[in-house]
Amino acid sequence: PHLRTFTDRFQTCKVQGAWPLIDNNYLNVQATNTPVLPGSAATATSKLTIIFKNFQECVDQKVYQAEMDELPAAFVDGSKNGGDKHGANSLKITEKVSGQHVEIQAKYIGTTIVVRQVGRYLTFAVRMPEEVVNAVEDWDSQGLYLCLRGCPLNQQIDFQAFHTNAEGTGARRLAAASPAPTAPETFPYETAVAKCKEKLPVEDLYYQACVFDLLTTGDVNFTLAAYYALEDVKMLHSNKDKLHLYERTRDLPG
Amino acid sequence: CKILKCNSEFWSATSGSHAPASDDTPEFCAALRSYALCTRRTARTCRGDLAYHSAVHGIEDLMSQHNCSKDGPTSQPRLRTLPPAGDSQERSDSPEICHYEKSFHKHSATPNYTHCGLFGD
């Protein structure tokens, strides 16, 4: 999947299986990623597990779990708030669009989480205060988390180079560059560009991610995934000057 | 292995509450040098772990991207404290503790928010 970190780094990761997105004293988020096509290096998120830890007079421990084709509007115990404590309403789930869009507000830690199902796969977005991000007591045993440090280099796909290589070529010519089995031949680069431009007129990294996803999968739903990811940034990012991220000139090989 | 502490301190120094070190300022390079120093210190106990190698490569990448020299000043991280998680000994009847912004305003300016997102393939 594509990852935008807390430090506004933008990466495309081929991480497979369960990886922690966030792991601090208040919250644990784990994403499970699966290959989009058999044998593909590119992966997308098929499951999200969010654990809100027990917090003072506010909330009991609550677990939210979303999977492909199952985006519940409740925690796994069936509740929609933080339990029986005095401040239980400081944790709330709201269903925005049935089966497609859920928002979780954790006011006690100033955090908003948006989970969507777009096509077969899930998207995740979070707005969180810096000090909550940094609230890690035991650096030894609390895990590595992608939202803070990004994906390991050996788990990154240089999709910007892929995008450059792809210009002016049809899907057949992409076979060598593609990290996945080639997309259907009926899906040339020009079509991918047109579909992405429609939804993402600014040629930023979200637009490039969209083109990459269409060329590697042939699945138009990924256009919406990039579109909604950018919409979530607009809603959640505190720095309105950093909504769009652009390709940086790279001194190192990808 | 304390490499995650290095990561967090770098993040804190470059995303601080008032004027964060923007990407192309001397402050950013100073924060990077601090990050590099921190990782060097942890090398003995972290050298076999993924987080250490990710940090080392990430620093090299960022140093190169931002034309930072290896020598020069370093920066100190900014840190604040949040109430302890879990069942605290100091229980409060006030619901204010369950509203982050209200309780935050008591000891600081507006909280500095940050964003993370995961989507597509």
Epitope: W19, P20, S141 | R41, R44, T45, R47, D49, H53
Partner: antibody, heavy 115, light 112 residues
Framework: EVQLVESGGGLVQPGGSLRLSCAAS????????MNWIRQAPGKGLEWIGM????????HYADSVKGRFTISRDNSKNTLYLQMNSLRAEDTAVYYC????????WGQGTMVTVSS | DVVLTQSPLSLPVTLGQPASISCRSS???????????LEWFQQRPGQSPRRLIY???NRFSGVPDRFSGSGSGTDFTLKISRVEAEDVGVYYC?????????FGQGTKLEIK
Amino acid sequence: EVQLVESGGGLVQPGGSLRLSCAASGFTFSNYGMNWIRQAPGKGLEWIGMIYYDSSEKHYADSVKGRFTISRDNSKNTLYLQMNSLRAEDTAVYYCAKGTTPDYWGQGTMVTVSS
Amino acid sequence: DVVLTQSPLSLPVTLGQPASISCRSSQSLEYSDGYTFLEWFQQRPGQSPRRLIYEVSNRFSGVPDRFSGSGSGTDFTLKISRVEAEDVGVYYCFQATHDPLTFGQGTKLEIK
């Protein structure tokens, strides 16, 4: 909860070989360096060696260099210790431990080298 | 190789009393800018070792605060402020500053 379970120990003749396994759970195995440490009966602890998270580097104690090989299979969350040319002095409980420096240890598996 | 020498090798203590174990290194364990990778492990009878202290004085997660570590350079100490029955076992110092990693020979703590 971090769990490490060693297996593969037993009785072997001098000069023989044995492969120990360490099954890991409760943490992201592929993120961490791993160690093997042993303890002869009634004796202290001896570090055998360690392997990086991606197997890119391995370090060994002089006493086992050239005879023992550490490997790992991250897809199976398993660490291995291949022991060749075994000697009587290799008789010990063998522990695997998580981290570049060992923080969590398994319960150990006994290796007896005797004719 | 770095040799770690512990003393005493046997330490009989009365319950509730303090205990102190010394670990002396054959060379300085300071690695860089004050970082010293000296650790302490506890091995209860019939169990595997458990990490107590790392970097001379930092308690590992779940370790009671009656355990404390101190020292620098080549001389290090593990202190137990009030010994409890569950503290019986062998205590090892361990260094990760130099390759190969080495352990002390162990100090057996028993109740008087």
